[in-house]
């Protein structure tokens, strides 16, 4: 059952899903100048059986200029760099993920994918919160939110997290503390987290191995 509301907004915090529950949908969005192929599904869907979960349908983008063709346009050098970075991020995140029964991992990028991923979560999904760089967790309970359903209405539980001050960010479950504080890195060497809406993941350039893709907070 789809969650028909959004995870709570925590000031100075972002969230991400470690894995995606079966039933989760991911919009097949294309970058500017490209569109989803006519025969293509508008979504990828996390499906599975008792032993294995995977993403159904593959997102495919084609040039908006190309008529009646599904041929992939070779990206320009700048685009290739962007795509390669996204692949690197995805591989890092996959390495970070635990294989949970009934869950899918982060799907690999597709050619000419949009910079934001829009997910539609289902009841039972858990997302984990982390204070953004420069803020720390002041009051720590479970820094997570779960989509629950009561009387046919969906809601997300309130994460017990308050972000304050100016120290290193807290870590997601299973992530190691960085060797050096990210505060010591120039801004150009860290990824910027842009606030977006409705289960969007902002894929930004990652320059350090400690950087992950985060599902961002809401505006």
């Amino acid at each position: 059952e789809l969650c028909d509301d959004d995870p709570p907004k925590i000031t100075h915090a972002t969230f991400k899903a470690v894995a995606y529950k079966e039933g989760t949908m991911l919009n097949c969005e294309c970058k500017r100048g490209f569109r989803r192929i006519k025969s293509g599904s508008p979504y990828m869907l996390c499906t599975g059986n008792s032993s294995h979960s995977s993403w159904d349908n593959q997102c495919q983008c084609t040039s908006s200029a190309a008529r009646n063709t599904t041929k992939q346009v070779t990206p320009q050098p700048e685009e290739q760099k962007e795509r390669k970075t996204t692949e690197m991020q995805s591989q890092m995140q996959l390495a970070d993920q635990v294989s949970l029964p009934g869950h899918c991992r982060e799907p690999p990028p597709w050619e000419n994918e949009a910079t934001e991923r829009i997910y539609h979560f289902v009841v039972g999904q858990t997302v984990y919160y982390q204070c953004v760089q420069g803020y720390r967790a002041l009051h720590r309970g479970p820094a997570e939110s779960v989509c629950k359903m009561t009387h046919g209405k969906t809601r997300w539980t309130q994460p017990q997290l308050i972000c304050t001050g100016e120290t290193e960010p807290s870590q997601f479950p299973g992530e190691e503390e960085p060797q050096a504080s990210p505060d010591g890195l120039p801004e150009s060497e860290t990824s910027r987290l842009v606030t977006t809406t409705d289960f969007r993941i902002q894929t930004e350039v990652a320059a350090t191995m400690e950087t992950f893709i985060f599902t961002t907070e809401y505006q």
Partner: antibody
Framework: QVQLVQSGAEVKKPGSSVKVSCKAS????????MHWVRQAPGQGLEWMGY????????EYNQKFKDKATITADESTNTAYMELSSLRSEDTAVYYC?????????WGQGTLVTVSS | DIQMTQSPSTLSASVGDRVTITCSAS?????MHWYQQKPGKAPKLLIY???NLASGVPARFSGSGSGTEFTLTISSLQPDDFATYYC?????????FGQGTKVEVK
């Protein structure tokens, strides 16, 4: 009490546009998505899409992606759905329905008639 | 898209009859929801998450099922129950409804 009050019936010419409104009261407008459902004469219900009033994010049924544009105005607690390039087959009753799960509250419906 | 097929499309019954409407989904879904609609009125939530009665709905209504097959039952049809009933899934986009079952006077 929760109420969704829609704008009145409209008669439009083919090719024109129409904007249907849905004014919400009795709850926090930005806390629930607003969905739109259409019902052609003598036909069943079809989900068209929704808007998240707090962010402006919209999700559409692909069938209506080029037909409908859903917007919301937080200041007046009103959701809108604009239908463009009207054709006779767009003649229907259009409903807004409060989301957050099952549709527990519905507007009274707005009949849009497209006729030359 | 998940197709929802209701049967029968029209059902002729009398007050006091036990009425059963079935809804078949083209793919497995988590829950089914049911709405009742009377002519010229907006749909009204009847049953949510397969078997739970919405507020104010009489106990003569019940719902059951799982996977792809779901049922709405009215144990003893009352005059107020003559209406059209729709099943609805919100397990995946686009959200879809059944084509409706009209319960009319026999």
């Amino acid at each position: 009490q929760v109420q969704l009050v829609q704008s009145g019936a409209e008669v439009k010419k083919p090719g024109s546009s129409v904007k249907v409104s849905c004014k919400a009261s009795g709850y926090t407008f930005t806390s629930y998505r607003m969905h739109w459902v259409r019902q052609a004469p003598g036909q069943g219900l079809e989900w068209m899409g929704y808007i998240n009033p707090s962010s402006g994010y919209t999700e559409y049924n692909q069938k209506f992606k080029d037909k409908a544009t859903i917007t919301a105005d937080e200041s007046t607690n009103t959701a809108y759905m604009e239908l463009s390039s009207l054709r006779s087959e767009d003649t229907a009753v259009y409903y807004c329905a409060r989301g957050g799960g099952v549709f527990d509250y519905w507007g009274q419906g707005t009949l849009v008639t497209v006729s030359s | 898209d998940i197709q929802m097929t209701q049967s029968p499309s029209t059902l002729s019954a009398s007050v006091g009859d036990r009425v059963t409407i079935t809804c078949s989904a083209s793919s497995s879904i988590s829950y089914m929801h049911w709405y009742q609609q009377k002519p010229g009125k907006a749909p009204k939530l009847l049953i949510y998450t397969t078997s739970n009665l919405a507020s104010g709905v009489p106990a003569r209504f019940s719902g059951s099922g799982s996977g792809t097959e779901f049922t709405l039952t009215i144990s003893s049809l009352q005059p107020d129950d003559f209406a059209t009933y729709y099943c609805h899934q919100r397990s995946t986009y686009p959200l879809t409804f059944g084509q409706g079952t009209k319960v009319e006077v026999k």
